[in-house]
């Protein structure tokens, strides 16, 4: 038996590794948007600039009509940045007016809409207060987090005010997944 | 009301490298991709590339190895070299803004014919 | 890159005609087709954008419809201004490419 090699009992089974290449992803930049027609109880969608710029798509990863598709089941990270800019006036005003086309928060959600469910689902939702900062005011809110996404889903980013989002800069306004 | 205004010399010879400016007035030059597009004689339009206010390219394929833009967001203009040039490039020349790819190009400069001769 | 052809290459009409154009993409290229006017010695005017949205200022019997690689514009009642050549164009990718133009002339 002198210099005979054993096989271990349980020997593990590797699968070949996938190359990040590959796989879904895209990173999408703010745009100049249109007034459009949303959703009874649904903040607004966010259009944006799928191949210019810094924007991408890539591995079937597909932009279309304000949604990214996703292409295929698994873990995805999810992300989005907001930039919001206006003034402080706009706060008194609300109060003084009743304008309740200006608020005095911001908020941005990322949804998800699957075909087979019939209400969209809010995956990850960020507020912040605008009437306690400066007098021209710039407010990021940046959200991100890991979900399990189906084939067919689809994802968008909803503001509470689209005429406030900043988007001058793609580095400031942007929203992106990648399959891990 | 935005202008665009393209100017440089009508005439290049072979070889040599053409140079187009683009002045943008009544508007900044930032947070929009500013085009290219040439439309030679009897043709189509050609794309030639774009450039973004942050300095950023892309270009036609077709053109990449002869083509460089730049950009001045200090004076609102921004430019084209086409090196090694023929007599196939010769075209009207036009630069145009396209705010994202969902808006097409919005606004465009009146041309400027570029003629390659000897 | 994706090829964008139209049809007719030339039509005649008269003016108060209904005329249509149509451009075909040779892949998908969602909704990102625009449409243009060029008249000679000027510059393409941008008519509508997005498939079907009609820019600032322009009248609204232009219109333009489709998804996908097959697409089309309508005039509802063609103007002695309309006149002109007509362009389509895919801003789905770069490079951007235009079809070769549809000439409209005076029947």
């Known amino acids: 038996l002198k210099g005979q090699e054993f096989a271990p009992s349980h020997q593990q089974v590797y699968a070949p590794l996938r190359a990040d290449g590959d796989k879904p992803r895209a990173h999408l930049t703010v745009v100049r948007q249109t007034p459009t027609q949303h959703f009874k109880n649904q903040f607004p969608a966010l259009h944006w600039e799928h191949e210019l710029g810094l924007a991408f798509t890539k591995n079937r990863m597909n932009y279309t009509n304000k949604f990214l598709l996703i292409p295929e089941s698994g873990d995805y990270f999810i992300y989005s940045q907001v930039t919001f800019r206006g003034m402080t006036s706009e706060c008194s005003e609300i109060r003084q007016a009743g304008r309740p086309n200006k608020p005095d928060s911001i908020t941005v959600v990322i949804t998800k809409v699957t075909d087979s469910y019939p209400e969209p689902t809010q995956l990850l939702m960020g507020t912040k207060s605008v009437c306690e900062v400066g007098s021209n005011w710039f407010q990021p809110i940046y959200l991100g987090a890991m979900f399990s996404l189906q084939e067919g889903d689809k994802l968008m980013v909803n503001v509470s005010d689209i005429s406030l989002v900043d988007y001058t800069k793609e580095d400031k306004t942007f929203f992106g997944a990648f399959l891990l | 009301q935005v202008q665009l205004q393209e100017s440089g010399p009508g005439l290049v010879k072979p070889s040599e490298t053409l140079s187009l400016t683009c002045t943008v007035s009544?508007?900044?030059?930032?947070?929009?991709?500013w085009s290219w597009i040439r439309e030679p004689p009897g043709k189509g339009l050609e794309w030639i590339g774009y450039?973004?206010?942050?300095?950023?390219?892309n270009y036609n394929p077709s053109l990449k190895s002869r083509v460089t833009m730049s950009i001045d967001t200090s004076k609102n203009q921004f430019s084209l070299k086409l090196s090694s040039v023929t007599a196939a490039d010769t075209a009207v020349y036009y630069c145009?803004?396209?705010?994202?790819?969902?808006?097409?190009?919005?606004?465009w400069g009146q041309g400027t014919l570029v003629t390659v001769s000897s | 890159d994706i090829q964008m052809t139209q049809s007719p290459s030339s039509l005649s009409a008269s003016v108060g005609d209904r005329v249509t154009i149509t451009c075909r993409a040779s892949?998908?290229?969602?909704?990102?087709l625009n449409w243009y006017q060029k008249k000679p010695g000027k510059a393409p005017k941008l008519l509508i954008y997005?498939?079907?949205s009609l820019q600032s200022g322009v009248p609204s019997r232009f219109s333009g419809s489709g998804s996908g690689t097959d697409f089309s514009l309508t005039i509802s009642s063609l103007q002695p201004e309309d006149f002109a050549t007509y362009f389509c164009?895919?801003?789905?990718?770069?490079?951007?490419?235009f079809g070769q133009g549809t000439k409209v002339e005076i029947k």
């Open positions: 892949q998908s290229i969602n909704n990102y």
């Open positions: 009544g508007g900044s030059i930032s947070s929009y991709f």
């Open positions: 164009q895919q801003s789905y990718s770069t490079p951007r490419t």
């Open positions: 450039i973004y206010y942050s300095g950023s390219t």
């Open positions: 145009a803004r396209e705010i994202g790819s969902y808006y097409g190009f919005d606004y």
């Open positions: 997005a498939t079907s």
